[in-house]
Amino acid sequence: VPRWRQQWSGPGTTKRFPETVLARCVKYTEIHPEMRHVDCQSVWDAFKGAFISKHPCNITEEDYQPLMKLGTQTVPCNKILLWSRIKDLAHQFTQVQRDMFTLEDTLLGYLADDLTWCGEFNTSKINYQSCPDWRKDCSNNPVSVFWKTVSRRFAEAACDVVHVMLNGSRSKIFDKNSTFGSVEVHNLQPEKVQTLEAWVIHGGREDSRDLCQDPTIKELESIISKRNIQFSCKNIYRPDKFLQCVKNPEDSSCTSEI
């Protein structure tokens, strides 16, 4: 008789999830010499241990602590780029500006990027059919808790000037409910972080508005200022030119506003 299985509202675990995590770990440790000591099998065991046999609506940050310990990585704290709702451009930027890091440029972020996973209470099975949706089912699900945990740690590690890339095409350029707005902003350490510099990325070719004056940016400024961190904001009117100028900063057209 087939066992009853909980039906969740979100997509199930990404197919070949164990193989993908292990392969990504091996690839990352090969590319990053400072992480060559990492035992990828142990990393997978710790990852699996965080959610297997546990109710997928009852996951805690403590569940991920063994994985956090194995994935400990020192990133230059003054080279951190946060992002919200504009992941692709942020990743394109750090691929060019190699000394800067998004969360997904770290081992743990790289392992889990774009993946979904969950298990089932009291069985060692991975659920490939469905996983809890953050809104419709529960917030303490394996994926959400993972990103909350690594995002908090990433923000806590930051120092000096921290940059955040924000999507100027969205109705809420700064969204208090995003990972950046709900986790990272509140875990920047005022004694370490001097300034948060927001880069607002414009979508339209002819968009010359100063999006740094947007009400949601003013809200971000207020939150940051109350935490005694300085705030700065820049419009990136031409993201294509912005990336080009990161690649070729000596280009004569790169002195003008981008």
Epitope: T72, Q73, T74, V75, P76, C77, N78, R153, E156, A157, C159, D160, V161, Q189, E191, K192, Q194, T195, E197, S225, N228, Q230, F231, S232
Partner: antibody, heavy 116, light 111 residues
Framework: QIQLVQSGSELKKPGASVKVSCKAS????????MNWVRQAPGQGLEWMGW????????TVADDFKGRFVFSLDTSVSTAYLQISSLKAEDTAVYYC?????????WGQGTLVTVSS | DIVLTQSPASLAVSPGQRATITCRAS??????????MHWYQQKPGQPPKLLIY???NLESGVPARFSGSGSRTDFTLTINPVEANDTANYYC?????????FGQGTKVEIK
Amino acid sequence: QIQLVQSGSELKKPGASVKVSCKASGYTFTNYGMNWVRQAPGQGLEWMGWINTYTGEPTVADDFKGRFVFSLDTSVSTAYLQISSLKAEDTAVYYCARNPGWFAYWGQGTLVTVSS
Amino acid sequence: DIVLTQSPASLAVSPGQRATITCRASESVDNYGNSFMHWYQQKPGQPPKLLIYRASNLESGVPARFSGSGSRTDFTLTINPVEANDTANYYCQQSHEAPWTFGQGTKVEIK
């Protein structure tokens, strides 16, 4: 290039007040907080605190609370240190130094002498 | 407050030799692998000059003869080889936890 230029030496009598200025150039003033550091004659360095140049919020170290006030005039990219009710033991060189918590940029220092 | 203790208080070194100054913090100054300990050189009548930030990063324009190492509570500034114009006071400073604090200084003299 980044520069912090402080006001000149001051000779004051006990009980008087003094205001030391620190004018910044070569960067966006409101992007980096300004620290104040004291060095008494022949002594080491003491961090007095800092001022958030974006909000104007001062953070004063416990040993300097009361008579020491940090202020700003962002229109001229200048930070100020005011000391009231001066005492002989306030005699020192006062430095401004730009954040972050490691100080790559310092003013040249302002000697404040308190003597009757 | 985090107390920083430098040793030795003074040091006399011949040109071409190695000078080593240590700084011990009363508690860890590390945060996620980054150490918030910095080193300065100060010559008479001048403001301090940043040499090393975050334990081991050489400030731009500072000769590679200067190097820093250490983590958590124990840190070292090394000058190798020492030159005649390295005569100065050297200070460590932490920015892990307010109030920022400095070591009491080490006076380096060239024989």
